[in-house]
Interface confidence: low
């Protein structure tokens, strides 16, 4: 999917006033300091690429992510603000209603959402230089 | 273009040292997870360790536990294996690829040429 | 760990005509998120191996469609519906559910 036409501004929003709660959340009893962020991006629609991988491919180590609910908040505001998204997402929605949510978080799991909390951070400041 | 390019093969006697490398090209590297896997003259494919985007999480097979280390930088693109000890049964060529976790279930989608590695007196 | 067994060894196809091999796993590759990981490559001859089915089924980026992947649980099977020339070398058949990742010892195919 090509994030290029979404409507940037709504999504920062829906971050700001709940997606990033709910990332703290989750990495809630982890310190701050535990992972480095190395996954980057270099503009929004970039950003929102690499959001997408991180939050609802399956992984090796992690594979419960996409029913978190910072990721199904994260979903309903691409489904929102980008158009055509939600067509392009029909079949991993319907693999998604079978899923069975994951109780354990993995140590990957809370390295993937540090990472993740990394790259909505730069997506809020498009216009930062990159390190 | 895509690129992952190893360098640092040759030939080492039983009990000695080489460091492999890997140059990445054309992507953003600290995105994804690597994995070094090797390949026995006429044998199949062996896994031989991974390393997730941020060094936070590594692994190893038994076979080269406590020899080998691997290892990446992110400033410079690049991935490392550090192979100790090295024994007769660690020729093979080596491949640097992309992947083991991050994308697509941790399968492989971009392999490097392989670099020789012989373990032989 | 989990073993990989592929069969058969080797298989001999006739152009345009099609071809098939199985991978068993010693366990279930599916994990509690639905999805199963077993993926397949192809080397061909003097090459590296490349990517051509991902998560049992998905082809990967620039993979003909007359590759395709099925299965589950602890079977799998990839179809050539039909074989071409550039079609030959080994197959190997991956699991990424749990380290150590493990490999298929390999299927080769060659044109008869």
């Known amino acids: 999917y090509d994030f290029t036409n979404c409507d940037f501004e709504k999504i920062k929003a829906a971050y700001l006033s709940t997606i990033s709660k709910d990332l703290i959340t989750y990495m809630s009893g982890t310190k701050s300091t535990e992972f480095n962020n190395t996954v980057s991006c270099s503009n929004r629609p970039h950003c929102l690429t690499e959001i997408q991988s991180l939050t609802f491919n399956p992984t090796a180590g992690c594979a419960s992510l996409a029913k978190e609910m910072f990721a199904m908040k994260t979903k309903a505001a691409l489904a929102i603000w980008c158009p055509g998204y939600s067509e392009t997402q029909i079949n991993a929605t319907q693999a998604m209603k079978k899923a069975r949510k994951s109780k354990v978080t993995t140590n990957k799991c809370l390295e993937q959402v540090s990472q993740l909390q990394g790259l909505w951070r730069r997506f809020n400041r498009p216009l930062l230089k990159q390190q | 273009e895509v690129q992952l390019v190893e360098s640092g093969g040759g030939l080492v006697q039983p009990g000695g040292s080489l460091r492999l490398s890997c140059a990445a090209s054309?992507?953003?590297?600290?995105?994804?997870?690597m994995t070094w896997v090797r390949q026995a003259p006429g044998k199949g494919l062996e896994w031989v360790s991974s390393?997730?985007?941020?060094?936070?999480?590594?692994y190893y097979a038994d076979s080269v536990k406590g020899r080998f280390t691997i290892s990446r930088d992110n400033a410079k693109n690049s991935l490392s294996l550090q192979m100790n000890s090295l024994r007769a049964e660690d020729t093979a060529v080596y491949y640097c690829?992309?992947?083991?976790?991050?994308?697509?279930?941790?399968?492989?989608?971009?392999w490097g040429q392989g670099v020789l590695v012989t373990v032989s007196s | 760990d989990i073993v990989m067994t592929q069969t058969p060894l080797s298989l001999s196809v006739t152009p345009g005509e099609p071809a098939s091999i199985s991978c068993r796993s010693s366990?279930?590759?599916?994990?509690?998120?639905?999805?199963?990981?077993l993926h397949w490559y192809l080397q061909k001859p003097g090459q590296s191996p490349q990517l051509l089915i991902y998560?049992?089924?998905h082809r990967a980026s620039g993979v003909p469609d007359r590759f395709s992947g099925s299965g589950s649980d602890t079977d799998f099977t990839l179809k050539i519906s039909r074989v071409e020339a550039e079609d030959v070398g080994v197959y190997y058949c991956?699991?990424?559910?749990?380290?150590?990742?493990?490999f298929g010892g390999g299927t080769k195919v060659e044109i008869k």
């Open positions: 991956e699991q990424t559910l749990q380290t150590p990742f493990t």
């Open positions: 366990q279930s590759l599916l994990h509690s998120n639905e999805y199963t990981y």
């Open positions: 390393i997730t985007f941020a060094s936070s999480y590594i």
């Open positions: 054309g992507f953003t590297f600290s995105n994804y997870d």
């Open positions: 998560l049992v089924s």
């Open positions: 690829t992309r992947g083991g976790g991050a994308y697509y279930g941790g399968s492989l989608d971009v």
